[in-house]
Amino acid sequence: HTAAQDNCTCPTNKMTVCSPDGPGGRCQCRALGSGMAVDCSTLTSKCLLLKARMSAPKNARTLVRPSEHALVDNDGLYDPDCDPEGRFKARQCNQTSVCWCVNSVGVRRTDKGDLSLRCDELVRTHHILIDLRHRPTAGAFNHSDLDAELRRLFRERYRLHPKFVAAVHYEQPTIQIELRQNTSQKAAGDVDIGDAAYYFERDIKGESLFQGRGGLDLRVRGEPLQVERTLIYYLDEIPPKFSMKRLTA
């Protein structure tokens, strides 16, 4: 089903407007901001979600060492340009004609330039490292229980096949979830790791994107797992291109 037929809502994206005007009176939902039709049986792309977020009223808003090429989303929110499939366009510009290139998760991967800046292709983010710190607990979580629960969560809630959860690392109180998905691995219908990571990030922050479902209640063997800090690193198939000035700052 593309949306909940009974009351015509989008289970996977509350930032939509839905009406029974699809073929045969079926419920059809469109993302706020872009007006693009979305498939409510799966996750909405991060680009459309960011666009919807920017259009909404403002009040609605062994551990791995990240590689030297890992990107962190320091720029925060912006109103992105999305292609007809809902993916980020490789080049993004703001209202003052400042432009930059982004990767497939919408994170800037070049210095900012002007309208002459060229971004030849949308570079795929193939490796995402989600770094979490959990609140103090009576004891450490069992690593294999934690691994199993996080894999289950990504499969059942975010529809991400466990083969894209490369590893779960744990050194109390730090949890690292490695998502990996090469272009060659991603089949039609597979959820993108960038979209799954974004939904997870919003869930962790208590800003669930799901319609009518409770927020994320993460438990390991019945013990609540409460996250107090999240940091996400993005690794692209082609390393980013920043000037030395930025790298030494």
């Epitope: 049986s41 894999r151 289950r152 499969r155 083969k163 959860v165 490369a166 691995q185």
Partner: antibody
Framework: QVQLVQSGAEVKKPGSSVKVSCKAS????????INWVRQAPGQGLEWMGV????????SYNQKFKGRVTITADESTSTAYMELSSLRSEDTAVYYC????????????WGQGTLVTVSS | DIQMTQSPSSLSASVGDRVTITCRVS??????????MHWYQQKPGKAPKLLIY???NLESGVPSRFSGSGSGTDFTFTISSLQPEDIATYYC?????????FGGGTKLEIK
Amino acid sequence: QVQLVQSGAEVKKPGSSVKVSCKASGYTFTDYSINWVRQAPGQGLEWMGVISTYYGDASYNQKFKGRVTITADESTSTAYMELSSLRSEDTAVYYCARYGDGYNQFDYWGQGTLVTVSS
Amino acid sequence: DIQMTQSPSSLSASVGDRVTITCRVSESVDSYGNNFMHWYQQKPGKAPKLLIYRASNLESGVPSRFSGSGSGTDFTFTISSLQPEDIATYYCQQSYEDPYTFGGGTKLEIK
């Protein structure tokens, strides 16, 4: 403890449909997807499809596409598998099986439902 | 679809013997070191029971005489010391991509 209890044996005529139920207990129903697997007499195991109990939609083995419908009722913690246009080759034991935590293994199985297709 | 070739299709062994079953897959089921290969035991008239998941992980409550190994396309299931209650048919299964597929089964009998 986790249990999957299936409906009883059925005898059906060729061309008709059968609907088998699988009632889950001992865990939160929407936390785990449910698969359906069948086994013809003296034969091996064949995966038919899986339903996301969280989202309520299913994906199917192409071999059965168009003939099999998997549904779930969250209010009763029950999954259903309906197979239409039955033929004698569909005579088999049908199992429901829950996904395990991490790697899409099937960690709990129903006891099986024998469906006999005979004229 | 991923094809599973399990061998032997049947075997006869004595109590206390070491028993080995192999499963060869038509394409790799390894994703970043995680092998989506599992082993089940099925006794006559009963539902299958999960013994090994992710190629080598023993399911909770399963005796330690059962083990699994392998990666990529070649996998092995071993019973270190056969017991009378191990008489059953054993199946390998991949869950790397759907349709999930099973090996043809190995029927184990006591000599």
